[in-house]
Amino acid sequence: ELCDDDPPEIPHATFKAMAYKEGTMLNCECKRGFRRIKSGSLYMLCTGNSSHSSWDNQCQCTSSATRNTTKQVTPQPEEQKERKTTEMQSPMQPVDQASLPGHCREPPPWENEATERIYHFVVGQMVYYQCVQGYRALHRGPAESVCKMTHGKTRWTQPQLICTGEMETSQFPGEEKPQASPEGRPESETSC
């Protein structure tokens, strides 16, 4: 089941998935001046069996200059109405990011890929939040959002990270990087 919305944005923070649940789709988007190859995949799909998950399909881009003069509109998957973009940034991934069963790791970049990745997440997906440079977390708890199914509708839990520019000394030892704590997680929230 695809999540209806994007993960919530919060002030002074960015988010990233550390691993992607089976069923996640990643659009094959090309940078300006390039397009998806004819008969190329619309998206990559995280699939797998009980022991191993991987991305099906490969994204391939080719120069738009090689195309004929007839303007083609690139079709998008039906789910395109709801899209989640993540900038291509250095991932905040722990070493064991893909050791989670039923999850794929971040797909490697492909040639002439667009600067933003558009994912279509599935129920149960978790994304992790981190304060942007110049801000710090007010607490050491987990900072994540989970896509859940409630009353037949999907929703993302509210991230509990507060990023503050306060210059006061922190109330706990050690600064930053508290966010991916495994301690009690919001997904324990009950649904109907």
Epitope: T164, Q171, R185, P186, E189, T190
Partner: antibody
């Protein structure tokens, strides 16, 4: 399902102390911020402060700093708002709310009346 | 402190009307704004967050828009259940501030 259950109506005299409670049910209480909001009779909403029950970090609105104390007991999934010496101007409805950015769940409110 | 100013304070309307409530911030708050509905004797109920994201379970006749300092809540076709007070709230800083409220009453 997620619920914030607040303690009942209180009638107090000026100068008395009071502690009202808010129990978090149906979710991981220690990992969600809880805020307190005041609504005086016929008036709007005022944010008082917030607590992270996991490690009891608190922040207060400047208007309420030193006037009230926010605390939590994570062993019983409960947040508290307390006064050491009530004034007639503390008469209001007090709501606890799950935050920290927007209030997705609210308690039913605790009415506090302070009168001599 | 960021001040939030709502207008109008009171709004008289009929069932089926399109209703718009405005909220202005004293400084830019990007899209860090939520809207709530409150009925007499009840707790506020979240309608919208991040200026335009509809909370799960809220009817689609409610919509929010705006960014920076000017925001609007629109009810496309007012229903009997919508007569209530409405509040905006900024969360650009963790120290929330609310608008003074708009009461939507029956004309």
């Amino acid at each position: 399902q997620v619920q914030l259950v607040q303690s009942g109506t209180e009638v107090k005299k000026p100068g008395e102390s009071l502690k009202i409670s808010c129990e978090g049910v149906g979710y991981s209480f220690t990992t969600y911020w809880i805020g307190w909001v005041r609504q005086m009779p016929g008036k709007g909403l005022e944010w008082m402060g917030i607590i992270y029950p996991g490690d009891s970090i608190t922040r207060y609105s400047p208007s309420f700093q030193g006037q009230v104390t926010i605390s939590a007991d994570k062993s019983i999934n409960t947040a508290y708002l307390q006064w050491s010496s009530l004034m007639a101007s503390d008469t209001a409805m007090y709501y606890c709310v799950r935050g920290p950015h927007w209030g997705d769940y609210w308690g039913q409110g605790t009415l506090v009346t302070v009168s001599s | 402190d960021i001040q939030m100013t709502q207008s109008p304070s009171t709004l008289s309307a009929s069932v089926g009307d399109r209703v718009t409530i405005t909220c202005r911030a004293s400084q830019s708050i990007s899209t860090w704004l939520a809207w709530y509905q409150q009925k007499p004797g009840k707790a506020p109920k979240l309608l919208i967050y991040k200026a335009s994201s509809l909370e799960s379970g809220v009817p689609s006749r409610f919509s929010g828009s705006g960014s920076g300092t000017e925001f609007t809540l629109t009810i496309s076709s007012l229903q009997p259940d919508d007569f209530a007070a409405y509040y905006c709230q900024q969360y650009s800083s963790y120290s929330w501030t609310f608008g003074q409220g708009t009461k939507v009453e029956i004309k």
